[in-house]
């Protein structure tokens, strides 16, 4: 009779195993091993007895021991079962970004792993097991399908396989896929509200603001704000679902015409997208042409507004005849004239709105002096040791150098306030003098004397 | 009958080197393993070294690696233990011995002495 | 490396007398222990095997137990022929070691 020990055995594969091959009989023929492993001997003393070693065992594998013995020959078989934990355990890839109330499909992937009988797949979210499968097939594939929520985001799934050898006195053999991070998201399906100015012009710079609310997670959007390929890099503030970003525009001459304004906002893997069209449009002041700014009483002046080709002027509220960006108009100058105003306005139609710009000059004319009788009485009578304050103003432009001499010598003092006496009385020759020429009038001051009783 | 007979040993001096022979019979050295076991006088038993016939895989104790080289020849049904740069401390008889991981059948020992 | 001791080192024994040699392990070596008896000038002698393992000519006196890292051999009864230094070894890794040894001798 041939018996084996052990008559079973677990061992992790490319392991090796002592199998010892007994007989009853105690001069057997033949005492050996059967088995396609390689094996050594490991002697001892006596014939009934051989332990081998078999190694590299890398499947189930039935060596059997044989005898033979005066009453015949007779075999026994040992069972080696191999155990080994998968080689690979993977979920399917998956986009990192999944929507809200999108059904998702984990798929888990086990190739490799022995015996299967006792190898089992387990599909987790976090540490909650979501789903639990023998391993069936090479690979083994395990799928199970998830409504996406909002509590899912930042969530790991993964997969485990359980090699449970505890029943046959091992361990409980554990290998866990990468895990797969959810990220969830809600983007609405109304685009983002862009407010910016219609029209911009040319060397300024004007507000764009993008927003939108309903986002989840707000704070991972990325909100890509452009005018035509200038990147406008926006100032966001978040709200518990919304977002505004705020950016300045600044545009140029080589911007001008019709430009695309964009504001796109990208969450997960969608995006949506709002276009709008800004007109940048260059439109200087109009310019007031005066022949010269400053002109002697008399001179013919001309004054010219000229403005953009598209634009309409109007030049001291009169409209151009025809309507158009040119007007002028002509004048003899007078001293009444002096520091007139001349005002251009122009208005210019840019994608609907009308624009106005406006620009002044003022005439300078030069005249006199002026003295007259108005101004500058020709006679005055004061009662003696009366306050008194002599007046006389010279008119002009420049403004006249006023002298008032009395023999050539004695100043009457004009707009001081004096104490009349006999000195003061008699003929002044007052002079009026400036670049324009000068002009003189005699002014008397009568002096009353107080009559004594 | 399984037999296992050492030879080689002898007096060397220190830094010098020997070869211990083990002729084995009643079985064939490329079926089992073959080791080499010393005993200083009146000390312990020490493993040395150990060989696969069938594929020349050596494992050697750390106080005789880079030292000595065990071998086999299957043809001769011989084992062999080189010893280089011998030590004082090396003086043992060595046993040549088979089997895996117990030691079956010994040889009678042969004595080395390293002295000067 | 696995150390391996033995006690006593040595003891004093009657010829019939039960005697218990103890070898402890430093570190769990499961079953992979081994005893031999040795006699000045002689070759060790395989006893037990695995611990436990009978040897085929050995007399039954000899008996083996323990797992992990404490182990015993028993004789059942000491017979004169029994004096001797007996040893433990380790196969459980490299490098295999032995225990010093426990003489037992004649009181």
């Known amino acids: 009779q041939t018996s084996v020990s052990p008559s079973k055995v677990i061992l992790p594969r490319g392991g090796s195993v002592l199998v010892t091959c007994s007989t009853s009989c105690d001069q057997p023929k033949l005492l050996g091993i059967e088995t396609p492993l390689p094996k050594k001997e490991l002697l001892l003393p006596g014939n009934n007895r051989k332990v081998y070693e078999l190694s590299n065992v890398q499947e189930d594998s039935q060596p059997m021991c044989y005898s033979n013995c005066p009453d015949g020959q007779s075999t026994a078989k040992t069972f080696l079962t191999v155990y080994w934990t998968p080689e690979r355990v993977e979920l399917a890839p998956l986009p990192s970004w999944q929507p809200v109330g999108k059904n998702l499909t984990l798929r888990c992937q086990v190739e490799g792993g022995a015996p299967r009988a006792n190898l089992t797949v387990v599909l987790l979210r976090g540490e909650k097991e979501l789903k639990r499968e023998p391993a069936v097939g090479e690979p083994a594939e395990v799928t199970t399908t998830v409504l996406v929520r909002r509590d899912h985001h930042g969530a790991n799934f993964s997969c485990r396989t359980e090699l449970d050898l505890r029943p046959q006195g091992l361990e409980l053999f554990e290998n866990t896929s990468a895990p797969y991070q959810l990220q969830t998201f809600v983007l609405p399906a109304t685009p983002p509200q862009l407010v910016s100015p219609r029209v911009l012009e040319v060397d300024t710079q004007g507000t764009v603001v993008c927003s939108l609310d309903g986002l989840f997670p707000v704070s991972e959007a990325q909100v890509h704000l452009a005018l035509g390929d200038q990147r406008l890099n926006p100032t966001v503030t978040y709200g518990n679902d919304s977002f505004s970003a705020k950016a300045s525009v600044s545009v140029t001459a080589e911007d001008e015409g019709t430009q695309r304004l964009t504001c796109a906002v990208i969450l997960g893997n969608q995006s949506q997208e709002t276009l709008q069209t800004v007109t940048i449009y260059s439109f200087p002041a109009p310019n007031v042409i005066l022949t010269k700014p400053e002109v002697s009483e008399g001179t013919e002046v001309t004054v010219k507004c000229e403005a953009h080709p598209r634009a309409k002027v109007t030049l001291n509220g009169v409209p151009a005849q025809p309507l158009g960006p040119r007007a002028q108009l002509l004048l003899k100058a007078t001293p009444e004239d002096n520091g007139r105003s001349f005002s251009c306005s122009a208005t210019l139609e840019v994608a609907g709105q009308l624009i106005h710009k406006n620009q002044t000059r003022e005439l300078r004319v030069l005249y006199g002096p002026r003295l007259d009788e108005r101004d500058c009485p020709g006679n005055w009578t004061w009662p003696e040791n009366s306050q008194q304050t002599p007046m006389c103003q010279a008119w002009g432009n420049p403004l006249p150098e006023l002298k008032c001499l009395k023999d050539g010598t004695f100043p009457l003092p004009i707009g001081e306030s004096v104490t009349v006496t006999r000195d003061l009385e008699g003929t002044y020759l007052c002079r009026a003098r400036s670049t324009q020429g000068e002009v003189t009038r005699k002014v008397t001051v009568n002096v009353l004397s107080p009559r004594y009783e | 009958e399984v037999q296992l007979v050492e030879s080689g040993g002898g007096l060397v001096q220190p830094g010098g080197s020997l070869r211990l022979s083990c002729a084995a019979s009643?079985?064939?050295?490329?079926?089992?393993?073959i080791h080499w076991v010393r005993q200083a006088p009146g000390k312990g038993l020490e493993w040395v070294a150990r060989?696969?016939?069938?594929?020349?895989?050596?494992i050697y104790a750390d106080s005789v690696k880079g030292r000595f080289t065990i071998s086999a020849d299957d043809s001769k049904n011989t084992a062999y233990l080189q010893m280089n740069s011998l030590r004082a401390e090396d003086t043992a008889v060595y046993y040549c011995t088979t089997s895996g991981y117990w030691f079956a059948y010994w040889g009678q020992g042969t004595l080395v002495t390293v002295s000067s | 490396d696995i150390q391996m001791t033995q006690s006593p080192s040595s003891l004093s024994a009657s010829v019939g007398d039960r005697v218990t040699i103890t070898c402890r392990a430093s570190q769990s070596i499961s079953n992979n222990l081994h005893w031999y008896q040795q006699k000045p000038g002689k070759a060790p002698k395989l006893l037990i095997y695995?611990?436990?393992q009978s040897i085929s000519g050995v007399p039954s006196r000899f008996s083996g137990s323990g797992s992990g890292t404490d182990f015993t051999l028993t004789i059942s009864s000491l017979q004169p022929e029994d004096f001797a230094t007996y040893y433990c070894?380790?196969?459980?890794?490299?490098?295999?070691?032995f225990g010093q040894g426990t003489k037992v001798e004649i009181k």
């Open positions: 695995h611990a436990s």
């Open positions: 070894q380790q196969s459980n890794s490299w490098p295999y070691t």
């Open positions: 009643g079985f064939n050295i490329k079926d089992t393993y």
């Open positions: 060989i696969d016939p069938a594929n020349d895989n050596t």
